[in-house]
Interface confidence: low
């Protein structure tokens, strides 16, 4: 799996999970989230050569096509596969609210 | 929806469905498929600016992050959303076989 266990331990130019810390205020301009101040969102990036963690038959076809036609703009892309929620604390007036924001943290990647 | 109805009628630099005909023999080196000789596979390509057909909360966060940090390599990618199968005819010896290859045709796209 293209997850932290593999990707963070290997120097990998191909599609893999990359670490990314997002500070809500600085990076997103969000001032409404009280806690946490930021989180490890991570992201997916890297090349998608033939058969590198292809998601569908179409992405396998596309990566093979791209091998034969390397200048064509038709190629698979490295995107998130498994995502996890993030629990946040914010205030409505003086009332604290705890909420779970779905699909906020990328745990693994795929070529799609 | 970023499908043929919208994308093929508009000049769109942002994430959209793009037409792509794949010839099995020429483009993939596949000689085993008897019919069809090729098919309209299509592909997804284009920029993913903030809120352009974002797939998940993470992709929305990432596109906003990318707006504020344009030099960062962390940005969503335009990938396939809805896929359809393709029916093919091939031979095992002299015996014709009809099979449906799943997820071969892209029908719409998303920013993920």
């Amino acid at each position: 799996a293209l997850d932290a266990a593999y990707c963070f331990r290997n120097v990998q130019d191909n599609c893999c999970l990359r670490p990314l810390y997002i500070d809500f205020k600085r990076d997103l301009g969000w001032k409404w989230i009280h806690e946490p101040k930021g989180y490890n969102a991570n992201f997916c990036a890297g090349a998608c050569p033939y058969l590198w963690s292809s998601d569908t038959q179409h992405s396998r076809v596309l990566s093979l096509y791209n091998t034969i036609n390397p200048e064509a703009s038709a190629s698979p892309c490295c995107v998130s596969q498994d995502l996890e929620p993030l629990t946040i604390l914010y205030y409505i007036g003086k009332t604290p609210k705890i909420e779970q924001l779905s699909n906020m943290i990328v745990k693994s990647c795929k070529c799609s | 929806a970023l499908d043929a109805a919208y994308c093929f009628r508009n000049v769109q630099d942002n994430c959209c469905l793009r037409p792509l005909y794949i010839d099995f023999k020429r483009d993939l080196g596949w000689k085993w498929i008897h019919e069809p000789k090729g098919y309209n596979a299509n592909f997804c390509a284009g920029a993913c600016p903030y809120l352009w057909s974002s797939d998940t909360q993470h992709s929305r966060v990432l596109s906003l992050y990318n707006t504020i940090n344009p030099e960062a390599s962390a940005s969503p990618c335009c990938v396939s959303q809805d896929l359809e199968p393709l029916t093919i005819l091939y031979y095992i010896g002299k015996t014709p076989k009809i099979e449906q290859l799943s997820n071969m045709i892209v029908k719409s796209c998303k920013c993920s």
Partner: antibody, heavy 125, light 112 residues
Framework: EQQLQESGPGLVKPSETLSLTCTVT????????VNWIRQPAGKGLEWIGY???????YYASWANGRFTISKDSSKNQVSLKLSSVTAADTAVYFC???????????????????WGPGTLVTVSS | EAVLTQSPGTLSLSPGERATLSCQSS????????LSWFQQKPGQPPRLLIY???TLTSGVPDRFSGSGSGTDFTLTISRLEPEDFAVYYC????????????FGGGTKVEIK
């Protein structure tokens, strides 16, 4: 209409660095490969290299590290830099895109279309 | 490194005559058909006539035709018109080669 236009200094001194720009209109550099090709006066065409839609640059073996191709998709510009120029680099420099067939790029077919009109570069002191 | 050799260097013919131009590659072009033909007139950029060895570009008169496969290719102009007198170049596309593309030296078709 899809067009390319080269620009740069007409005259460069020997040993200097030549910088050329190819400005494109009517299509996105995020989706297409752009090639640089040159033609010395009265001679044939020489493929220098290309920058792919994804930003990867490839060069002809004879380009021997003196050429650098880059792009700025937001400005719709592709640039060519040539270091330590000599009189042998005097030529008309063209940028050309891979053509499209049925809405899809043709890849390695050597099908260059459209082309820019070209810009003449003279290396002389 | 692939080398494309065009012959003859100069072809002297009269309007209405048939022109046959040859292009030979030192190694097979990719897919046996990644070969294009260009026409160039003084002070102008080259114009793509034929790609894929035999496919005419839109707007090119059908007196032009291309044939060949692998390493040997031919451009034929069935009946020369006054506007056909120009220099013709072939170009090959190569896969896995250090040079993706190569141009032939050109054939000048001049009025006899």
């Amino acid at each position: 209409e899809q067009q390319l236009q080269e620009s740069g200094p007409g005259l460069v001194k020997p040993s200097e660095t030549l910088s050329l720009t190819c400005t494109v209109t009517g299509f996105s550099l995020s989706s297409y490969t752009v090639n640089w090709i040159r033609q010395p006066a009265g001679k044939g065409l020489e493929w220098i290299g290309y920058i792919s839609y994804g930003g990867s640059a490839y060069y002809a073996s004879w380009a021997n590290g003196r050429f650098t191709i880059s792009k700025d998709s937001s400005k719709n510009q592709v640039s060519l830099k040539l270091s330590s120029v000599t009189a042998a680099d005097t030529a008309v420099y063209f940028c050309a895109r891979h053509m499209q067939v049925g809405g899809a790029p043709t890849g390695s077919m050597a099908a260059f279309d459209p082309w820019g009109p070209g810009t003449l570069v003279t290396v002389s002191s | 490194e692939a080398v494309l050799t065009q012959s003859p260097g100069t072809l002297s013919l009269s309007p209405g005559e048939r022109a046959t131009l040859s292009c030979q590659s030192s190694q097979s072009v990719y897919n046996n058909n990644y070969l294009s033909w260009f026409q160039q007139k003084p002070g102008q950029p080259p114009r793509l006539l034929i790609y894929g060895a035999s496919t005419l570009t839109s707007g090119v008169p059908d007196r032009f035709s291309g044939s060949g496969s692998g390493t040997d290719f031919t451009l034929t102009i069935s009946r020369l018109e006054p506007e056909d007198f120009a220099v013709y170049y072939c170009a090959g596309g190569y896969s896995g080669s250090s040079d993706k593309y190569a141009f032939g030296g050109g054939t000048k078709v001049e009025i006899k």
